[in-house]
Structures are given as structure tokens and as C-alpha cells.
Interface confidence: medium
């Protein structure tokens, strides 16, 4: 049925889906607070621009009776049920902020006539790539793949003189939502990562992973996994590791590595951690701007979703353009807007760009140090530490295949 959008005559509403099944176990109250904080900022920005309009959010909660797994497994139906709720109420905002699970976003995108933009904090999977009216404010799997391929091919840095073409991927099925889709993308036989690698095997059992660490007949020295240091320790423990093994630990949404008092445990010495640059968030508190810290990336993505809507609303209103048009629905991409803690860039397909940071453990200081950074917007790697104090021989990353060239 035709749903009218509450999106004109100076009154602009945001529909926020508050789903029980979510990419991250963040209390819905925190997400509400993030949205409300975003609304305050948007109202201020619109007022400063001389635009006397009303912007509000409507929170749409599911009943939680059927879809109560808490994770993303039953999110497909929950998302569609919430859309049905909107349809029955005959009321939709200018924009839909909500589904974070890949399953629900994919299905909702398929099953709705999207004449309005959809903003997601999540939807990491490749199946949500290249969607014309979907914007994703947390790094999707495609961005991770492009970094990995770029890094694998790099061979002209003082600390990486070999191109790599092989990898093991550890994926045991217990991963968080982000990790599940990141590893899913690496596993997929038709993905860019698989296409560019000559050898790739998925390890699904703890024992398979543990055996590879000292297996003289292993086909690759590189193992990719996803999670935090504790996750790695549970799996690896204090087992001996061959000296030319490199574990790439994908842990994008974790700021702990940048905290001053953090010391890297010994089991991290063979590990390169891939995380996101903390951006401006560590700097805000030193300035007189009275911004309450929204540390978690998930809640921050909700907040930035509100700010993105405010940014687009301001542009369209200043240009005298209609908000309830396909042009508005397709406009949430290829732009930079002022996020809560700095500029946020969206690529041509509405996916957030960011600075990924590859960290190593200094054998001297036992601290995490930045080895290089990678700008997803320009697909470019920038070396930072040209003479890292690695655990690996000659302070260089080994070849990915044992016995191929000098180690």
C-alpha cells in the first residue's frame, strides 16, 4: 500500500528501526540517546543556516516476541515486520535508519519500493554492496577485501619486500556479525580477494588452526582471523609458533590499542592487528566543545546517520528542492559531511570510507605501534614506521610461502 511520508511543509521525520536483532549488543536506550544527540546537533546546524524547520525521529520497536535471538539470525523477518508496521500506520519518515544485520537489510531492500534513503550502521556483507539507496556508515566487507589485496601485493616497503598470494582464513562460525561477513567475503570463491589469491584455505576447527602454527608442510605462512586479542588467546594460548607465521587479526571496531596504558601480551608478537584509526574521537575532550563521548562505533554510526540526514536536508532545502523524490533518495553518496567527531566520507555507492591502521607489537616496548595506514577512499597504503622492531627475522615480514626466497 502507498505509505505517505511525513516529510514536507517544514516538518521532517526520521524513521528509526529499533530492532531486537542487531549487529552489536548495544542497549537500544544508548542508540536512542545517540539519535537524540544527533537531532540536537542537526537542529542547531539548520538553525544556523537560517532554516526554520522541525526535525524529529520516530522510534519503531518490534514486539520482540518472535524475533528474540538478539543476534542477526532472525533479523530478516523482524525487518519486514517493522516495515509492515510502518505500512499499517501509513506513516513513513523522509529516511529510514535501522537495519544493521546484513540479512534484514538485504531482504528489506529487495522487498520494498525504495523511494526513500536507507541508512545502516552495519550491513557488512557483500550482498549489500552497490545498493542505490542504501548508505552504510560502518566499514563493509568490500573495504576490508580491498585493503588485504593491496597489502598482499605490496612488495616495495623496507619491511615488506615480498608480494603475497596465499592465505589461510580461520572461520569457526562463532564470530560476531561484523566478523562473520568479513570472513564470509574472504571465503567466497567469487570475491575479489579469492580472485587475486593463488591459494586460500578456510580453517574451521580450532585444531586445524593450532596444527598449522607449526606444520612444516603448510601452504601459507599467513593466517587471517577476526576478533580481539582475547579471542586469539583462547585459540592459540601459549603454543609455539613457527617464526615465519604472520597472523592478521581483523579487529576494526576496537579503540583499546590506542590507549596509553595498553601493553601488548606476548602472544601478540606474531600478529598484525588491522583496526580503524580512532580519528578525532581521542582529541575532542581537550577542547571546550561540550560534546559527550559516544565511544562505541555502533552508536556513533547511528548518530552520524542523523547528521548525514541533516546534511542532505540542509542542501536540498537551501536549493529549494523536494525531499520526497528519487533524487533525494539517491543523493546519500559521493560526499563528505561533518560527522560527530570529524569529516565522514561516503564513496560512490554510499559506503563509508575510513583510515585503516595496521599495528604490530614492538619487541622493544611491548606496545602496539602503527606499521602503516590505508585510506579506503583512494585505495592507497601509507607506510608509517619504516624500521619496525618486529619479531620477524631482519625486521621484515616473511614470504608467504616457506622456502621461497630468503627468509
Amino acid at each position: 500500500s502507498q505509505v505517505s511520508q511525513n516529510c514536507h511543509n517544514g516538518s521532517y521525520e526520521i524513521s528509526v528501526l529499533m530492532m531486537g536483532n542487531s549487529a552489536f549488543a548495544e542497549p537500544l536506550k544508548n542508540l536512542e540517546d545517540a539519535v537524540n544527540e544527533g537531532l540536537e546537533i542537526v537542529r542547531g546546524r539548520l538553525q544556523n543556516a537560517g532554516l526554520n524547520v522541525t526535525v524529529n525521529a520516530t522510534f519503531m520497536y518490534s514486539d520482540g516476541l518472535i524475533h528474540n535471538s538478539g543476534d542477526c539470525r532472525s533479523s530478516t523477518c523482524e525487518g519486514l515486520d517493522l516495515l509492515r508496521k510502518i505500512s499499517n500506520a501509513q506513516r513513513m519518515g523522509c529516511v529510514l535508519i535501522g537495519p544493521s544485520c546484513t540479512y534484514s537489510t538485504f531482504q528489506m531492500y529487495l522487498d520494498t519500493e525504495l523511494s526513500y534513503p536507507m541508512i545502516s550502521a552495519g550491513s557488512f556483507g557483500l550482498s549489500c554492496d552497490y545498493k542505490e539507496t542504501l548508505t552504510r556508515l560502518m566499514s563493509p566487507a568490500r573495504k576490508l577485501m580491498y585493503f588485504l589485496v593491496n597489502f598482499w601485493k605490496t612488495n616495495d616497503l623496507p619491511f615488506k619486500t615480498y608480494s603475497w598470494s596465499t592465505s589461510y582464513v580461520y572461520k569457526n562460525g562463532t564470530e560476531t556479525e561484523d566478523c562473520f561477513w568479513y570472513l564470509n567475503a574472504l571465503e567466497a570463491s567469487v570475491s575479489y580477494f579469492s580472485h587475486e589469491l593463488g591459494f586460500k584455505v578456510v580453517l574451521r576447527q580450532d585444531k586445524e588452526f593450532q596444527d598449522i602454527l607449526m606444520d612444516h608442510n603448510r601452504k601459507s605462512n599467513v593466517i587471517i582471523m577476526c576478533g580481539g586479542p582475547e579471542f586469539l588467546y583462547k585459540l592459540k594460548g601459549d603454543r609455539a609458533v613457527a617464526e615465519d607465521i604472520v597472523i592478521i587479526l581483523v579487529d576494526l571496531f576496537n579503540d583499546q590499542y590506542f590507549e596509553d596504558n595498553v601493553t601488548a601480551p606476548d602472544y601478540m608478537k606474531n600478529v598484525l592487528v588491522l583496526t580503524l584509526s580512532p580519528g578525532n574521537s581521542l582529541l575532542n575532550s581537550s577542547f571546550s566543545r561540550n560534546l559527550s563521548p559516544t565511544k562505541r562505533d555502533f552508536a556513533l554510526a547511528y548518530l552520524n546517520g542523523i547528521l548525514l540526514f541533516g546534511h542532505m536536508l540542509k542542501i536540498f532545502l537551501e536549493n529549494g528542492e523536494n525531499i520526497t523524490t528519487p533524487k533525494f533518495a539517491h543523493a546519500f553518496r559521493n560526499l563528505t559531511f561533518e560527522g560527530y567527531d570529524g569529516p565522514v566520507t561516503l564513496d560512490d555507492w554510499g559506503d563509508v570510507d575510513s583510515t585503516m591502521v595496521l599495528l604490530y607489537t614492538s619487541v622493544d616496548t611491548k606496545k602496539y605501534k602503527v606499521l602503516l595506514t590505508y585510506d579506503t577512499h583512494v585505495n592507497k597504503t601509507y607506510p608509517v614506521d619504516m624500521s619496525p622492531t618486529f619479531t620477524w627475522k631482519n625486521s621484515k615480514l616473511p614470504n608467504d610461502i616457506t622456502g621461497r626466497g630468503p627468509q
Epitope: S277, V370, D375, D385
Partner: nanobody
């Protein structure tokens, strides 16, 4: 390689002025906020000022508001700090920093305010 090179420090009398410069290389300068940070003798680091990637927003720590001005020239990959009405408490080593990565620091430039 990511590099930041500061210059322009020196000895100046109270009430005097200095202009600090920072030349950046090895990253897409025009996409990142830049900051000036200082370390007074025997003290910790203090964030002084920061500027948005396009120069349209600037923030200052309270103690320098109205006296210091941060600016940038994206064509030259440079950020500047114009310091007027200098006081003895502004003495220290001044560093520029980028939100691109926290691990890169220049050698700093020393500012001494003394009569």
C-alpha cells in the same frame, strides 16, 4: 612515508609574535583535520588548536583563544599557527599532529617567550 616537519620557532619577548609552519607529506593532507600540540618544560602534552580538513572550522584551547590563529594551505600541504600576544606560559616545544595517524610526530619547534 608519512612525515611532519615543523619550523618557525624562536626566542621572542612577551607580547611578541611568531608564525609556526608544518609541512606534511605521505598522506592525502586535504582529507584530514590537523592539530598543533605543545609541551611546556616538565609538563605533559597539551592540545592547542585544530583545523578541519577544508579550513572551515577551527577549535582552540581556552588559554590561547583570541591570541592564536590556526590556518592551512592544502595546495602546499601545510598548516600554520600564528601566535600573537605571546606570554611566558606559551614557552615549550610545538608539534603539529594529524588525525591520519597518532604515531607520526615531527621533531617539533621550540618557542621561548622571555624578556
Amino acid at each position: 612515508q608519512v612525515q611532519l616537519v615543523e619550523s618557525g620557532g624562536g626566542l621572542v619577548q612577551p607580547g611578541g609574535s611568531l608564525r609556526l609552519s608544518c609541512a606534511a607529506s605521505g598522506f592525502t593532507f586535504s582529507r584530514y583535520w590537523m592539530s598543533w600540540v605543545r609541551q611546556a618544560p616538565g609538563k605533559g602534552l597539551e592540545w592547542v588548536a585544530k583545523i578541519k580538513y577544508d579550513g572551515s572550522e577551527k577549535y582552540y584551547v581556552d588559554s590561547v583563544k583570541g591570541r592564536f590563529t590556526i590556518s592551512r594551505d592544502n595546495a602546499k600541504n601545510s598548516v600554520y599557527l600564528q601566535m600573537n600576544s605571546l606570554r611566558a606560559e606559551d614557552t615549550g616545544v610545538y608539534y603539529c599532529a594529524t588525525d591520519f595517524t597518532r604515531d607520526v610526530w615531527g621533531q617539533g619547534t621550540t618557542v621561548t617567550v622571555s624578556s
